[in-house]
């Protein structure tokens, strides 16, 4: 905290400039007013005030706005913007995305801060939903956004906001995170031809049932090992080696190499030795020939 | 990685000269607007001068008319020529891109003006 001292003569601010950053903390304490700070604070981002310098700034809007500050001058806050802690900005109302891509852009480049989550927090709580503008912002700044949400927090994302989701931005999701966007996915891009609808899907296909993917095993996609692996285990599990076949198309070979992993290794179990066999890869494991199955799991649904 | 190394202090009587040399490697240094900072024992840090990329200068009211602050960008040097030294100049000097916003951090070459 700076101390109280009078302002010398001659120094009392009359305007936000660049004769500031001569001032001493003490100095910019005494001799800045803080109402002339907030109505000129589109002045302040441009001035390159040492990051001391911005503490007493803030210090002086912190005294000006006890209660939190306006929009008016957070949108205009800048660099002065990485000197807020979380509980400053659980006090602001932040409503314009404008104001959210300012501030977004001060922290470009590094990553997500607790104080950006709590501003991105209080943003989409205060549009009551993540629309498909905030979305395009928000992983256009930071692509691993979309994972660090809930299931909880993504069940209010819009299936029209599901455009705007990239690839790379579910690289980080788990299972549950897609369990909650791929029926949106689906939702999204239910109007589009096979080929284009798969390009689309095929990131979000890790929350897919096993009936859909039977489905798509029906469309000669192609699907890559990577996505496959991806795949939900349960999902997985109820497809007969024909329809996997069909699934990956040529890059059925790679299932070899990938033979002792999830969910390939627990699919494999599950199939009849002499069904993998046909592939010609040499999987081993399946059930031997002569074999019943019984599904346990039915048999206790109908009792 | 940006580097910035200071030279040129020394101790020196009132009313004596001393230049400041700082070098600059790892950014484009005639796009860079370049600052002196300075921070006297048991004070805080204080601008003294600036360079703008387009050669226009700024001075602390403390050093105006003393001071002057230069720049070769071939070297990827800026200089703060030192006259009339007074004992209130004593104190580490340190130079910064305006941008990193920084101030008085790292090493900076000390100055100490005795009577």
């Known amino acids: 905290e700076v101390e109280k001292t009078a302002c010398p003569s001659g120094k009392k601010a009359r305007e936000i400039d660049e004769s500031l950053i001569f001032y001493k903390k003490w100095e910019l304490e005494a001799c800045v007013d803080a109402a002339l700070l907030a109505t000129q604070m589109d002045r302040v981002n441009a001035i390159p005030f040492t990051y001391e310098q911005l503490d007493v700034l803030k210090h002086k809007l912190d005294e000006l706005y006890p209660q939190g500050y306006p929009e008016s001058v957070i949108q205009h806050l800048g660099y002065l913007f990485l000197k807020m802690s979380p509980e400053d900005i659980r006090k602001w109302n932040v409503t314009s995305l404008e104001t959210l891509k300012a501030l977004l852009e001060v922290n470009k480049g590094h990553e997500m801060s607790p104080q950006v989550a709590t501003l991105i927090d209080r943003f989409v709580k205060g549009r009551g939903q993540l629309d498909k503008d905030t979305l395009d912002t928000l992983t256009a700044f930071y692509p691993g956004y979309l994972c660090s949400l809930s299931p909880e927090e993504l069940s209010s994302v819009p299936p029209s906001s599901i455009w705007a989701v990239r690839p790379q931005d579910l690289d980080t999701c788990d299972p549950r995170q897609l369990d909650v966007l791929y029926p949106k996915a689906r939702l999204a891009f239910q109007n589009m031809n096979g080929s284009e609808y798969f390009v689309k899907i095929q990131s979000f296909l890790g929350g897919a049932p096993t009936e859909d993917l039977k489905a798509l095993s029906q469309q000669n996609v192609s699907m890559d090992l990577a996505t496959f692996m991806k795949l939900r285990t349960d999902a997985v599990l109820p497809l007969t080696v024909a329809e996997v076949q069909k699934l990956l198309g040529p890059h059925v070979e790679g299932l070899k190499a990938e033979e002792r992993h999830r969910p390939v290794r627990d699919w494999i179990l599950r199939q009849r030795q002499d069904d993998l066999d046909t592939l010609g890869l040499g999987l081993q494991g399946g059930i031997p020939n002569g074999y019943l199955v019984l599904d346990l799991s039915m048999q206790e649904a109908l009792s | 990685e940006v580097q910035l190394v200071e030279s040129g202090g020394g101790s020196v009587q009132v009313g004596e000269t001393l230049r400041l040399s700082c070098t600059a490697s790892?950014?484009?240094?005639?796009?860079?607007?370049m600052g002196w900072y300075r921070q006297a024992p048991g004070d805080e840090c204080e601008l003294v001068s600036t360079i703008s990329s387009d050669g226009s200068t700024n001075y602390a009211d403390s050093v105006k008319g003393r001071f002057t602050i230069s720049q070769d960008n071939a070297k990827n040097t800026v200089y703060l020529q030192m006259t009339s030294l007074k004992p209130e100049d004593t104190a580490i000097y340190s130079c910064r891109t305006m941008a990193s916003r920084i101030g008085c951090w790292g090493q900076g070459t000390l100055v100490t003006v005795s009577s």
């Open positions: 790892g950014f484009t240094f005639d796009d860079s607007d």
